[in-house]
């Protein structure tokens, strides 16, 4: 059989390395050796590039060295493919050098902001070793954020003045870290080289961005001021590296600046004491550059009605996030702002808020949140300058068993009866939403009876026992993710009814 | 097989002037860029000046900027550092590379054997 | 300019032991990072380019890892040739700037 015809044939030009031509089928069935049959000078030479030596056969690709690659050139390229019962010949194809001429990449030398020119890097680079002294080269320019996966792209072509290229990239953010990468091609060639090594420059840092600005309202104290913790953070959309020397604040009572106060602070948190009446508070932030524009926050009234719009609100978990959605009914409100905290006994030690616009969900990733922990969740309808009502709910973003049981013990034991209290368990060692209480019982050698409550139930009263026995009880809280026992506990139901002794025991 | 060789060191008065040169071989000069590092006595690498492959381009650090000037003439394979004004600071050996450059290996993967200059009165 | 500071200055170590230095860049330099080796009287040489990758005829017992701003050299199984001069190099950004050099001795 002879062999298939040599199709698909590609040639590429590695500049000052060898012209290499591939084509199908790349294994024959039999042993195929090959002629790579070649013109060149424009057609003036020719020459062949052979594959019939053991190392080289079955082999579908052929590599022309220096010094008979002449540049420019137009090429000619058969290819014929032999085994023992004959020969076959492709079409012949035609290669224009430049056209398929593959390059090294550049090396990107320097990334530097310039003194003065705002979100702007400087690229320089250096024109690969191994190129053209006198073609124009076109330029692939890569760059993304540090913290990106995802790249941008600019394309651009330099004539070749000398190995020093410079590039200037506008429009970035400011203090922003940046991953750059080039690559180059002839102007006519349809090879790119390889992309360069990334490096990293840094856009020039400006006047912080701006800043968000929250608050938390606590109880009026006994001489009727109110502490309102107020806190800020860089808005979103910021730079990550922006950082800031200090913050002012100033803030007075509604219709009356004559009486502003100003604060100066390094934290990103500060307690006021205010009086009874509206406020308006300002804080900008500021570093060597100048300040950030203006964050405004109104502290209403002490009597004053706050509007309520939210009607529900649900929080479900995907695979990777907690999400939480609400009902509004005022179509016009479209920013709120959630609270995120720890429900624990002691005051939480870490408080999250996140303003939300255009929207009626908030996301966040489980693994921002402690499993096991449970989150209290509040949303605050904010319309201009006003702030509604917060709606609350609670979550976990992993349940798991309790770390303890219940702790329990059997009061007014009876004949036949006994009333078994139990203490909720504390919300450190919950582990999820206690979703019932099993209380089990065993008769001293008898079977083990059970009983399923509520989680709002911490008191059971069990009936049908028997006299003068001795019974083991414990008290199982569960979780969706199972049960934990409390400690066993032991009594004994009486013989016969004691009034007198109640009321004994009462007094 | 790449070679550099520098020359052109010596003991020289502070104030005065002195030119190193650095001889190319086994590669093509005229493709690449070089630099000039120095090292003082018992002291840590230092770069010093740096050359575009064509000559057209020159970059300094502000330590030697003004008094320093790095070139190269590609004919004969030679790259120069001529020294003015020359300070008891500039006492170092200075190396020739050749670098920065896109080929694999680092910036600068060969280095001459290093002439010493010593600025002393 | 990006400030390389390499630790330690100097370091007893006996023929066979695990050599580790640190090299730590005063601003993000992604992996672009060179090792040189100087011997007494030598020019130097390089180890070790692009944070990681390992130059032509040096042998594997010579390593080196990081990104961003901390960087790493290692020599697994310390020889007496070895002693000398280590120092980092970033190459990100012009100019060039070289660690401070890290000096291993006999102990």
């Known amino acids: 059989v002879l062999p298939a015809k040599p199709e698909n044939i590609s040639c590429i030009f590695y500049y000052e390395e060898n012209f290499t031509c591939t084509w199908s089928p790349e294994k024959e069935a039999s042993y195929t050796w090959y002629k790579v049959k070649r013109t060149y000078s424009y057609g003036y030479k020719s020459d062949i590039c052979s594959t019939d030596n053991s190392t080289r056969g079955n082999h579908a690709s052929c590599s022309f060295l220096p010094p008979t690659i002449t540049n420019p050139d137009n090429y000619t390229i058969q290819v014929e493919a032999q085994n023992a019962d004959g020969i076959m010949k492709s079409d012949i194809t035609y290669w224009n050098l430049d056209a398929i001429m593959k390059i090294e990449p550049p090396e990107i030398f320097s990334v530097k902001s310039v003194l003065g020119i705002k979100r702007m890097l400087q690229i320089k680079w250096i024109r690969p070793v191994l190129a053209p002294h006198s073609s124009t080269l076109k330029y692939t320019l890569r760059f993304r954020t540090i913290n990106s996966a995802y790249w941008m792209e600019v394309n651009f072509t330099k004539e070749d003045i000398d190995r020093d290229e410079t590039y200037n990239l506008t429009e970035l953010q400011a203090f922003t870290e940046y991953v750059m990468t080039l690559r180059c091609a002839p102007a006519e060639s349809m090879f790119w080289s390889g992309w360069s090594q990334e490096k990293v420059g840094t856009t020039e840092e400006e006047a912080p961005y701006g800043l968000d600005l929250w608050r938390v309202l606590k109880p009026a104290m006994v001489d009727g001021r109110r502490p309102v913790q107020l806190m800020w953070k860089k808005a979103t959309g910021a730079p990550v590296l922006e950082k800031a020397l200090g913050y002012n604040i100033w803030y007075f009572p509604e219709n009356n600046t004559n009486l502003t106060e100003t604060v100066n602070t390094t934290n990103q948190t500060h307690e006021l004491y205010l009086g009874g009446k509206t406020y308006w508070v300002y804080v900008v932030s500021y570093n060597s550059l100048g300040e950030s524009p203006v964050a405004t926050l109104r502290i209403p009234a002490l009597n004053e009605k706050t509007f309520q719009c939210i009607e529900a609100m649900q929080a479900c978990l995907t695979q990777d996030q907690l999400v939480v959605e609400w009902q509004s009914s005022a179509p016009e409100v479209d920013t709120w702002m959630v609270e995120w905290f720890p429900d624990v006994d002691s005051e939480p030690s870490s408080f999250s808020w996140e303003s939300v616009s255009q929207a009626r969900n908030w996301t966040i990733q489980k693994d921002e949140l402690k499993p096991l922990w449970c989150y209290n969740i509040s949303v605050y309808p904010v319309l201009r300058d006003r702030v509604g009502q917060p709606y609350s709910t609670q979550a976990y973003v992993q349940e798991g068993i309790p770390s303890a049981g219940p702790v329990t013990q059997a009061d007014s034991i009876g004949v036949k009866t006994v009333t078994i209290t139990w203490k909720e368990i504390p919300k450190s060692k919950r582990n999820g939403f206690i979703k019932n209480y099993t209380i089990f019982y065993q008769a001293e050698d008898g079977k083990e009876f059970s009983k399923t409550v509520n989680s709002n139930i911490l008191q059971y009263r069990l009936e049908s026992l028997t006299r003068r026995t001795s019974y083991s009880l414990q008290v199982m809280a569960s979780t969706n993710a199972g049960g934990t026992n409390g400690t066993k506990i032991n009594f004994k139901t009486l013989s016969i009814s004691h009034h007198h002794h109640h009321h004994h025991h009462h007094h | 097989e790449v070679q550099l060789v520098e020359s052109g060191g010596g003991l020289v008065q502070p104030g005065r002037s002195l030119k190193l040169s650095c001889v190319a071989s086994g590669f093509t000069f005229n493709n690449y860029w070089m630099t000039w590092i120095r090292q003082a006595p018992g002291k840590g690498l230092e770069w010093v000046a740096s050359?575009?492959?064509?000559?057209?381009?020159?970059y300094y650090p502000d330590s030697v900027k003004g008094r320093f000037t790095i070139s190269r003439d590609n004919a004969k394979s030679t790259l120069y550092l001529q020294m003015n004004s020359l300070r008891s600071e500039d006492t170092a050996t200075y190396y020739c590379?050749?670098?920065?450059?896109?080929?694999?290996?680092?910036?600068?993967?060969?280095w001459g054997q290093g002439t010493l200059v010593t600025v002393s009165s | 300019d990006i400030v390389m500071t390499q630790s330690p200055t100097s370091m007893s170590i006996s023929v066979g032991d695990r050599v580790t230095m640190n090299c730590k860049a005063s601003?993000?330099?992604?992996?672009?990072v060179d090792w040189y080796q100087q011997k007494t009287g030598q020019s130097p040489k390089v180890l070790i380019y692009?944070?990681?990758s390992r130059s032509t005829g040096v042998p594997d017992r010579f390593t080196g890892s990081g990104s961003g701003t901390d960087f790493t050299f290692t020599i697994s199984n310390m020889q007496a040739e070895d002693l000398a001069v280590y120092y980092c190099m970033q190459s990100n950004s012009y100019p060039p700037t070289f660690g401070g050099g890290t000096k291993l001795e006999l102990k």
């Open positions: 692009r944070a990681s």
């Open positions: 601003q993000n330099v992604g992996s672009n």
């Open positions: 590379t050749r670098g920065p450059t896109t080929v694999v290996g680092g910036w600068f993967a060969y």
């Open positions: 050359i575009t492959n064509t000559g057209g381009t020159t």
